[in-house]
């Protein structure tokens, strides 16, 4: 049994780091493998993660941690029984993938303005809470070419757009994702999408 693709890990910078790797053949990850992780610190101890299958030869493990700070560095040991298959390290702050925003809502009752709001996925005492910026994706269900991205570079989790920038009388969907420049993170996954029917009063034309 050998590791074909070494573990790569990302952290949500809150409570979970996810490591993925591939073995050289079909593997029952949960029965055959264990991933041990330990913070490099005098009081810490090793914890065991039981991996799940992620495709035939792929494995994924969710490492639990109560919090993350920028200096944290973990040792990782991948075991198959008594055989050490791989040894490495992981610094969560250097491999951050933020949590996806939630509760995306489209408010359509604000005088021909669409107000999109969502929730910051972090609690106020988490470092990322005040460092997230967002991208909002809006698309038409009827017209695949009607697809747009709005970058929200301010901290408030909301976006206002004129309803008239979208076509009237058709349905749209929106979703939002987050990233944090301070840790040069990857983008989060997209939030679940929300749907609304776009309608607005056409401006009265005077001749």
């Amino acid at each position: 049994m050998k590791v074909l693709q070494e573990p790569t890990c990302v952290s949500d910078y809150m409570s979970i780091s996810t490591c993925e790797w591939k073995m050289n053949g079909p593997t029952n990850c949960s029965t055959e493998l264990r991933l041990l992780y330990q913070l490099v610190f005098l009081l810490s101890e090793a914890h065991t993660c039981i991996p799940e299958n992620n495709g035939g030869a792929g494995c994924v493990c969710h490492l639990l941690m109560d919090d993350v700070v920028s200096a944290d560095n973990y040792t990782l040991d991948l075991w198959a029984g008594q055989q050490l298959l791989w040894k490495g390290s992981f610094k969560p702050s250097e491999h951050v993938k933020p949590r996806a925003p939630g509760n995306l809502t489209v408010h359509t009752n604000v005088s021909d303005t669409l107000l999109l709001t969502w929730s910051n996925p972090y609690p106020p005492d988490n470092y990322l809470y005040n460092h997230l910026t967002y991208a909002v994706n809006i698309w038409s269900e009827n017209d695949p070419a009607d697809f747009r991205i709005y970058n929200v570079t301010y901290l408030e989790p909301s976006l206002r757009i004129a309803a008239s920038t979208l076509k009237s009388g058709i349905s749209y969907r929106a979703r939002v994702r987050a990233w944090a420049q301070c840790y040069n993170t990857t983008w989060s996954e997209w939030s679940p999408s929300t749907k609304w029917h776009n309608s607005y009063r056409e401006p009265f034309e005077q001749h």
Epitope: L39, S44, H47, A71
Partner: antibody, heavy 122, light 107 residues
Framework: EVKLAESGGGLVQPGGSLRLSCAAS????????MNWVRQAPGKGLEWVAN????????YYVDSVKGRFTISRDNAKNSLYLQLNSLIAEDTAVYYC???????????????WGQGTMVTVSS | DIQMTQSPSSVSASVGDRVTITCRAS??????LAWYQQKPGKAPKLLIY???SFQSGVPSRFSGSGSGTDFTLTISSLQPEDFATYFC?????????FGGGTTVEIK
């Protein structure tokens, strides 16, 4: 409410013994490293000892090694410090304190008791 | 043992002032440093852990920085309730050790 409450302090003669207790409430006591920290009158803070969640690891400052013993009873949510062969320099307020982290511990103390005074004097 | 040296030992300041306290370790401690505030007759209160991470509930005017041997606690705009003694503490190796303290007094 998360709380620690020390007891057992008092006046003791040099060479004497005391047993300090710390009652924990409002949190999962068995999940945290626990510490004793002392402060002599008008002086700074001095870490004395700590103990792992299950009691299997214990560490002490050199000046109390062989004289003080830290222990815990997770079933009673209690931390203890047995003080033997006391000397005048042990006179201090003794605080119990919780490590803020569980997974992982952080070596920083977020919950403190009100302290109990130990006076060693003849 | 790792010695922790705080400076200054005391500082006089006014409400609204920016106050900086430094802590130097006798050898490298990575980022394993905490800061505490203590008022007379009271137990210490944790402000910062791991050099720069905020303890929940601590006002944002307190911030910590540094790694290795040199660390700083900054109070961006001193408030009346901030007059107290501040201690740093290392957790890189046993025995855990505290700095001697810095007293912030009213000017």
């Amino acid at each position: 409410e998360v709380k620690l409450a020390e007891s057992g302090g008092g006046l003791v003669q040099p060479g004497g013994s005391l047993r300090l207790s710390c009652a924990a409430s409002g949190f999962t006591f068995s999940s945290h490293w626990m510490n004793w920290v002392r402060q002599a009158p008008g002086k700074g803070l001095e870490w004395v000892a700590n103990i792992k969640q299950d009691g299997s690891d214990k560490y002490y400052v050199d000046s109390v090694k062989g004289r003080f013993t830290i222990s815990r009873d997770n079933a009673k949510n209690s931390l203890y410090l047995q003080l033997n062969s006391l000397i005048a320099e042990d006179t201090a307020v003794y605080y119990c304190a919780r490590d803020r982290g569980v997974r992982p511990p952080r070596g920083a103390f977020d919950i403190w008791g009100q302290g109990t005074m130990v006076t060693v004097s003849s | 043992d790792i010695q922790m040296t705080q400076s200054p030992s005391s500082v006089s300041a006014s409400v609204g002032d920016r106050v900086t306290i430094t802590c130097r370790a006798s050898q490298g401690i990575s980022s394993w440093l905490a800061w505490y505030q203590q008022k007379p007759g009271k137990a210490p209160k944790l402000l910062i852990y791991a050099a720069s991470s905020f303890q929940s509930g601590v006002p944002s005017r307190f911030s910590g920085s540094g790694s290795g041997t040199d660390f700083t606690l900054t109070i961006s705009s001193l408030q009346p309730e901030d007059f107290a003694t501040y201690f740093c503490q290392q957790a890189n190796s046993f025995p855990l050790t505290f700095g001697g303290g810095t007293t912030v007094e009213i000017k």
